[in-house]
């Protein structure tokens, strides 16, 4: 089907990682050939269309904002391209998943969170009273989903030998295998500073 | 020590808005999830609205969904509800109350402000 | 949303006796409950949170246990100051609930 095309792209303009009520805006890569694009949501196998922009010439790449976000918008999202009356292509899948449905879990470090580049440090996230299946780190203002992620309870993320790029604040949320995409609320923050200068000065909070 | 001192209540005609407010003092106001809390004359506790530390992460119960919204300024040290379209079951003491650290728990409340929406 | 009841809606006791105070959840919640304690014109108090674990500064005649539905309040030796109206909390999920309340009154 989709002969020597690359797969088109689908993404979020921000995080998909969105809290309860929030909105996202998803962008499909345009297709040349593509007269109708829809964004579909896959919902157990099925397909359903959340949105669809016809072809205007030059167009930039569609757009498609998701308001109000809440547990039956959480899920896997795919651009659908009709290119003729029996013709389709898709794009790459998106997931989504929505925040603030469970209470909080705690995150906390092994160590001072001030770290000079090569140093390891280990985050541990737990929720002692509320047994979530999974626990996935976040970093704010990533535009993908977290890789870090762990079926342990507590969770235990290993960051290291860090490098600057690793300086940011964290959080982590809890959830469950039967429901992915439904997520907890924030975690506390953890605000990781990377420097190679031994002479900054820097303080952290509880 | 720990305070949170809420402000704004008074009477009210149904159908009209009014805005609490809540200073915190006595802890690191921008670490902490907050809460609304209300309580009819005579009645239980009702949980009202929550927001994260970061004010991204909002929920409220469904009796305000969509008139009430929860705020806050963390270089303020002040935490908001702004009740709009305002009806007679909303006639309640409010309280703020913060979060605990590492979980969900209400470990600190204020005094309570009163609010009586009455023609 | 989690329902919480709680039983007995009241109760009257002497200083000196064992309390007993229930809270049922309409579905597991683990061990994500906490207990208040609220006397009039005041706002409420933290005893236990995570349904056994006792609040800081908390007399230690007061406990709590259970996990998933049932859970349990008790007040070993009942004192003076422990008459007051008392009520359970859900933290597992949104919407957070409270339970009705049970108030303690003097026999």
């Known amino acids: 089907q989709e002969g020597d095309f690359p797969m088109p792209f689908i993404s979020a303009k921000s995080s998909p990682v969105i809290p309860l009520d929030g909105s996202v805006k998803i962008q499909c890569q345009a297709i040349r050939e593509a007269y109708l694009t829809q964004l579909m949501i896959i919902k157990n196998s099925t397909y359903r269309e959340i949105g669809r922009r016809l072809k205007f010439w030059n167009e930039t790449d569609p757009e498609f904002v998701i308001d109000h976000m809440d547990a039956n918008k959480a899920g896997r999202y795919q651009c659908q391209y009709r290119i003729g009356h029996y013709r389709f292509r898709y794009s790459d899948t998106l997931e989504l998943v929505v925040t603030g449905l469970y209470g909080k879990p705690f995150l906390s470090a092994d160590r001072g969170l001030v770290l000079m580049p090569g140093e390891n440090i280990s985050l541990t996230c737990s929720s002692a009273h509320i047994p979530f299946d999974r626990f996935s780190l976040a970093k704010e203002g990533e535009l993908s989903l977290p890789q870090h992620q762990s079926g342990e309870h507590p969770a235990n993320f290993s960051l290291g030998p860090v490098d600057l790029n690793v300086s940011g604040i964290y959080r982590c949320y809890g959830w469950y295998n039967r429901s992915p995409y439904l997520w907890s609320f924030p975690s506390n923050a953890l605000e990781l500073v990377v420097t190679d200068s031994i002479h900054q000065d820097y303080t952290t909070q509880n | 020590q720990v305070q949170l001192v809420e402000s704004g209540g008074g009477v009210v005609q149904p159908g009209r808005s009014l805005r609490l407010s809540c200073a915190a003092s006595?802890?690191?106001?921008?670490?902490?999830?907050l809460h609304w809390v209300r309580q009819a004359p005579g009645k239980g506790l009702d949980w009202v609205a929550v927001?994260?530390?970061?004010?991204?992460?909002?929920y409220f119960a469904d009796s305000v969904k969509g008139r009430f919204t929860i705020s806050r300024d963390n270089s303020k040290n002040t935490l908001y509800l702004q009740m709009n379209s305002l009806r007679a079951e909303d006639t309640a003491v409010y309280y703020c109350?913060?979060?605990?650290?590492?979980?969900?728990?209400?470990?600190?409340w204020g005094q309570g402000t009163l609010v009586t929406v009455s023609s | 949303a989690i329902q919480l009841t709680q039983s007995p809606s009241s109760l009257s006791a002497s200083v000196g006796d064992r309390v007993t105070i229930t809270c049922r959840a309409s579905?597991?919640?683990?061990?994500?409950l906490a207990w208040y304690q609220q006397k009039p014109g005041k706002a409420p108090k933290l005893l236990i949170y995570?349904?056994?674990s006792l609040e800081g500064g908390v007399p230690s005649r007061f406990s709590g246990s259970g996990s998933g539905t049932d859970f349990t309040l008790t007040i070993s030796s009942l004192q003076p100051e422990d008459f007051a109206t008392y009520y359970c909390?859900?933290?597992?999920?949104?919407?957070?609930?409270f339970g009705p309340g049970t108030k303690v009154d003097i026999k």
């Open positions: 109350v913060r979060e605990g650290y590492s979980g969900s728990w209400f470990d600190y």
């Open positions: 579905q597991g919640i683990s061990s994500a």
């Open positions: 006595g802890f690191t106001f921008s670490s902490y999830v």
């Open positions: 927001i994260s530390d970061d004010g991204r992460n909002k």
């Open positions: 909390q859900q933290f597992n999920s949104y919407p957070f609930t």
């Open positions: 995570g349904a056994s």
